[in-house]
């Protein structure tokens, strides 16, 4: 007798590998016999696709090799003409051992930027990632972070970040290892040692010492008065990232020599300078024999101290007086951080003004002195304690700094403005203005022994001065 | 840019005063940091600075001609003049004015195209 | 006075390097300027402060100076190179000196 179709073993839930067989039964039992077909996600699987084998009278479903796009909702429909068609539908979850799809690289980075090491992978179950770094697992911190995708993450990357490092994919069916990478953190030149001044006799030797660090490791070269240095004994060493180099020279002439750290990232280079000045004890050349040319200031240092209208002489003793001077400049306002407010605009002034002299209008280009009366102010009201440290701490051999060889002037040694008030500069705006008070404060200490004029002032801060030798 | 002229008489007779005028245009003459200079160049010789007047009309003169030379200026027309007196045929060249600036060490940075002036009776 | 001594001519081969001097007594102590003169022509300046190129001069033209003697480099010389070059410094008193003049053969 004709009896409608009856699924006797509904279809289940199947695991399968990748690449392995899967296999779906659907037990009819009917007759006349019935025409069986079969759907993924309600798509007909037509029976000549060589991925499927359809056997049994099409009661049993096998995919040959499963793929990871496999997985989904299959059904089994039977009719027979008998009664309605019956249906029953299982699902195929496609289970995947860990598989790296994009390991991780090798990273240069430059320390204190972010570093991204990645690892994306593929599986089912979805696999855990982790990172050893050398031999330990990595532990994560406030900088170190495995991010979702499974990429590690490092925020302001240090030295010791540096090393070798592999994740690691992790799910019930197995564990996936990338190779592996080396993450190389590269350092910016740093001097951690510069230069110290030094003020000698004619023909005696001085070593001047730098020390650099840096990854890779800087290399060291010296500049005299804006060239390579063409005599001296330079002598190198390099232990645990640092390179330490000493320049020994035979003094004849005073000389700015600058220390340049450099290395190299990709195709870019860092560079840290420092500077020392070697002065001759007694070297003092006339006036007349200064030797430069005037130009308006085109530095950053001295922006907003010098006359914004005026000529400064640059020094030809210099090969490249605009950036020697400018770094003469910048090595001593670094020390100027650390003295008082009140000291600190005039010391500045002083300063720019001094390295950066005002150029005399006439037919030679000459520098300007800077008027006597206003030094002393510097020396004795607005800079009276730090000026008196600095000279005791250079009478013990103790100075490190450039400032008291180069970049502050001997006042003693000055013209004073009452001898001829055109043939020096002034610093109008050390004048404390009581109709102006924002110049700078009252002064709470007894009156100086100083002469200063009473010229107008103003809030800003540009003053003008120089001194009365030039290093050629 | 600044522009240079001279203008004078091409001819001069032996012990008369020698007169020049030099035009300035594109600047002023007593703008600072620069000055002004008459410098000459006789016949197949090499060149010889006369004299000098700076900015603030102060001038200065080569020593072998000091007493013979006088240089003077008019600002409101922006010239500047050569006196040289008692010539002699010796004093025959090319005059050029020129302008000396301190932003290149007090070089001569622009010249005037020349006078002749010959000295002759 | 201040005297500055030039050798009358220098000759060169076209491309090579030309070397003029100027003698003089300490002129490593003073900028030294050096001029261009063409036949007809007024001089142009073509370097200032011992070793300074105008801006619109060659870079083959380049200057040193020290001790007693300046130097005029021109490096590559060229045709348009041929004149008369003259070594200029101010002395102490604001006085102009200018050397003799030499003149620059390229072949």
């Known amino acids: 007798l004709p009896k409608a179709p009856v699924i006797t073993t509904p279809l289940e839930t199947v695991d399968a590998l990748v690449e392995e067989v899967a296999t779906f039964m659907c037990a009819v039992e009917s007759y006349p016999q019935p025409e069986i077909s079969w759907t993924r996600n309600k798509i007909l699987i037509k029976l000549f696709d060589t991925r499927y084998s359809i056997r049994e009278n099409g009661q049993l479903l096998t995919i040959l090799s499963v793929e990871d796009s496999d997985d989904g909702i299959y059904c089994c429909t039977a009719n027979n003409g008998v009664g309605g068609a019956v249906e029953s539908c299982g699902a195929l979850q496609v289970k995947m051992k860990p598989k790296i799809t994009r390991p991780p690289i090798n990273v240069k980075i430059i320390e204190g930027l972010k570093a991204v090491l990645p690892c994306t992978t593929m599986g089912n179950p979805k696999p855990s990632v982790s990172w050893i770094k050398g031999d330990s697992p990595l532990r994560e911190n406030s900088r170190t972070a495995v991010l979702e995708s499974g990429s590690l993450r490092i925020h302001n990357v240090q030295k010791e970040d540096a090393g070798q490092y592999r994740c690691v994919a992790k799910n019930s069916l197995g564990t996936a290892y990338s190779k592996v990478v080396k993450l190389e953190v590269e350092v910016f030149a740093r001097i951690l040692r510069a230069p110290e001044s030094h003020n000698v006799t004619f023909g005696s030797f001085v070593t001047l010492h730098c020390t650099a660090t840096g990854i890779p490791v800087p290399t060291i070269t010296w500049i005299e008065n804006g060239n390579a240095v063409s005599s001296g004994s330079i002598q190198e060493s390099v232990k645990d990232r640092v390179i330490d180099s000493r320049l020994q020279l035979f003094i004849t002439k005073p000389g700015l020599y600058t220390c340049i750290a450099t290395n190299k990232h990709g195709e870019k280079f860092s560079t840290a300078k420092a500077a020392a000045t070697v002065s001759i004890a007694e070297w003092s050349k006339p006036q007349k024999d200064n030797k430069g040319y005037c130009a308006q200031y085109r530095g950053e240092v001295c922006n907003a101290v010098l006359a914004k209208d005026a000529l400064v002489f640059l020094n030809t003793s210099y090969a490249d007086p605009e950036e020697a001077q400018e770094l003469l400049v910048h090595t001593a306002w670094n020390e100027l951080k650390v003295v008082s407010p009140l000291c600190r605009p005039a010391a500045e002034a002083l300063l720019c003004n001094h390295v950066f002299q005002e150029c005399s209008p006439g037919v030679v280009p000459t520098p300007i002195p800077i008027c006597r009366e206003y030094c002393l102010a510097v020396k004795e009201l607005f800079c009276a304690k730090e000026w008196l440290a600095m000279e005791e701490k250079t009478h013990r051999g103790l100075y490190r700094s450039e400032m008291h060889l180069l970049s502050v002037p001997e006042c003693s040694k000055l013209p004073s403005m009452h001898w001829d008030p055109t043939a020096c500069a002034r610093l109008p705006h050390l004048d404390y203005n009581k109709e102006n008070p924002k110049t700078f404060p009252p002064m709470t200490s007894s009156k100086p022994s100083v002469d200063i004029p009473n010229l107008p002032s103003s809030s800003s801060s540009s003053f003008s001065v120089s001194p009365t030798y030039s290093m050629t | 840019q600044v522009q240079v002229q001279e203008s004078g008489p091409g001819l001069v007779k032996p012990s008369q005063t020698l007169s020049l005028t030099c035009t300035v245009s594109?600047?002023?003459?007593?703008?600072?940091?620069?000055?002004w200079s008459w410098i000459r160049q006789p016949p197949g010789k090499g060149l010889e600075w006369m004299g000098v007047i700076a900015y603030d009309g102060s001038t200065y003169y080569s020593p072998s001609l000091k007493s013979r030379t006088s240089i003077s200026r008019d600002t409101s027309k922006n010239q500047f003049s050569l006196h040289l007196s008692s010539v002699t045929p010796d004093d025959t060249a090319v005059y050029y004015c020129?302008?000396?600036?301190?932003?290149?060490?007090?070089?001569?940075?622009?010249w005037g195209q020349g006078t002749q002036v010959t000295v002759s009776s | 006075s201040y005297e500055l001594t030039q050798s009358p001519s220098v000759s060169v081969a076209l491309r090579r390097t030309a070397k003029i001097t100027c003698g003089g007594d300490n002129i490593g102590s003073k900028n030294t300027q050096w001029y261009q003169q063409k036949p007809g022509q007024a001089p142009v300046l073509v370097i200032y402060a011992d070793s300074r190129r105008p801006s619109g001069i060659p870079e083959r033209f380049s200057g040193s100076n020290s001790g007693n003697t300046a130097t005029l480099t021109i490096s590559g010389a060229q045709a348009e190179d041929e004149a008369d070059y003259y070594c200029h410094v101010w002395d102490s008193s604001t006085n102009a000196w200018f050397g003799g003049g030499t003149h620059l053969t390229v072949l």
């Open positions: 594109g600047g002023s003459i007593t703008a600072r940091y620069y000055s």
């Open positions: 020129a302008r000396g600036s301190s932003r290149v060490a007090a070089a001569f940075d622009s």
